[in-house]
Interface confidence: low
Amino acid sequence: SSFSSSAPFLASAASAQPPLPDQCPALCECSEAARTVKCVNRNLTEVPTDLPLYVRNLFLTGNQLAVLPAGAFARRPPLAELAALNLSGSRLDEVRAGAFEHLPSLRQLDLSHNPLAYLSPFAFSGSNASISAPSPLVELILNHIVPPDDKRQNRSFEGMVAAALVAGRALQGLHLLELASNHFLYLPRDVLAQLPSLRYLDLSNNSLVSLTYVSFRNLTHLESLHLEDNALKVLHNGTLAELQGLPHVRVFLDNNPWVCDCHMADMVTWLKQTEVVQGKDRLTCAFPEKMRNRVLLELNSADLDCDPILPPSLQTS
């Protein structure tokens, strides 16, 4: 292996000075040839101060960081090459404003599998200005960052994440956003409008019931939209038209509890003619009971009736 492990006695290097070119922080493995530092599964409680300046890929996974303060990666001279930062599974419960400041080349950030009770609105923008300097981030991976119920703040988790994504319009250059497995009940209305460069959006394995108030209209570059494993009952005409209008999009809708009643007619018609939905032949009804497991593409208007006994408010979301 081209990775060199540091000896523990190197840990006392003076943090005020720039690290030696070949220095590797204690409890880390470093490869200058691969421009990679791995400090993985070492129960670190803070980000090492003496990271080598050549680092381009930094793995800090499986630690116990708890809090990421402002300037957690700010160094003098700065870590100008750092492009990919993986902090997944490091027991972070707080990411503060400016945590990723002074990383001018940071393209990919993975915070997945951290129970984020607090994500500052300015975690990614760095400042509270209404329009911040653009973030260099291209890929932001936030899968399973929902904290346990007893650690949640009073405000909605969806709102907290949305605020961080839209603050200062800093993420206008973001191409990839993964928000899977976060128990989202809804997607805040204005989030996607602030992310016009998105190519890939993963909202799978959430609890989204409806997309009625979500607009995809300005996501003209969107190529993949993952909505598998949610609680979607039907897609309404406005959503269908917006998706059809996106020039490159592929939509994934598997494993949603589709309600095959009279409100499903427009969606079935759309499914039969669209090229947008991948694996559309696998979509099946979950409700009502008499329609369970019927394939959506095989339905016709005669199959899609509403029970007149039910009040309209119970017939659809």
Epitope: H113, H175, S181, R199, S204, E228, D254, Q278, G279
Partner: antibody, heavy 121, light 107 residues
Framework: EVQLLESGGGLVQPGGSLRLSCAAS????????MSWVRQAPGKGLEWVSS????????YYADSVKGRFTISRDNSKNTLYLQMNSLRAEDTAVYYC??????????????WGQGTLVTVSS | DIQMTQSPSSLSASVGDRVTITCRAS??????LNWYQQKPGKAPKLLIY???SLQSGVPSRFSGSGSGTDFTLTISSLQPEDFATYYC?????????FGQGTKLEIK
């Protein structure tokens, strides 16, 4: 370092069964979609089956549908392929592979070394 | 299903040569094309994704181009370790399909 290690291959008679395993390490297995790809002796690559990272979505080539089952155990970082009703034409090296995670996600960026399945009487 | 067709199926070349392999998709796949290298008895290795992006650690003598239905893999100056079989793969759909392969042999 990403590592994928297949096991479970061997010689089996037509109509028999085998279960392949792929032990993963060096990456967040539970966040990665996975695939099985096979290669018959002297032939090209043929996709067999894929599974979403959560295990919720499973997909199969027409040639194996109804006979093969892909599954995963994220707690054990292991991918499986249960192969039933095996035929001579299933003889191949079976590779497990990870779906890459970049802006264009549909590539297979890491592969195991493969395990040989031979179906013969 | 999208069919992928590679040409040529085999070719002979010498160290230092510039080599081009082509791949054609049966329908437009935008830039969702990947290239792999496979040596005898070894697993395939991802070289290029999204038509032209070099996978980390792959030498810069490899390059890819194309969009829509027609794609090329170019090796600017063949090295001894480059003699192998090369496969293209469409990544437009979640379920991959591969070309039949191009075997690059020493002349």
């Amino acid at each position: 370092e990403v590592q994928l290690l297949e096991s479970g291959g061997g010689l089996v008679q037509p109509g028999g069964s085998l279960r392949l395993s792929c032990a993963a390490s060096g990456f967040t297995f539970s966040g990665s979609s996975m695939s099985w790809v096979r290669q018959a002796p002297g032939k090209g690559l043929e996709w067999v089956s894929s599974i979403y990272y959560s295990g919720s979505g499973t997909y199969y080539a027409d040639s194996v549908k109804g006979r093969f089952t892909i599954s995963r155990d994220n707690s054990k970082n292991t991918l499986y392929l249960q192969m039933n009703s095996l035929r001579a034409e299933d003889t191949a090296v079976y590779y497990c592979a990870r779906y890459g995670r970049n802006v264009h996600p549909y590539n297979l960026d890491y592969w195991g070394q493969g395990t040989l399945v031979t179906v013969s009487s | 299903d999208i069919q992928m067709t590679q040409s040529p199926s085999s070719l002979s070349a010498s160290v230092g040569d510039r080599v081009t392999i082509t791949c054609r998709a049966s329908q437009s796949i935008s830039s969702y094309l990947n290239w792999y290298q496979q040596k005898p008895g070894k697993a395939p290795k991802l070289l290029i994704y999204a038509a032209s992006s070099l996978q980390s650690g792959v030498p810069s003598r490899f390059s890819g181009s194309g969009s829509g239905t027609d794609f090329t893999l170019t090796i600017s100056s063949l090295q001894p370790e480059d003699f192998a079989t090369y496969y293209c793969q469409q990544g437009y759909y979640y379920l991959p399909t591969f070309g039949q392969g191009t075997k690059l042999e020493i002349k």
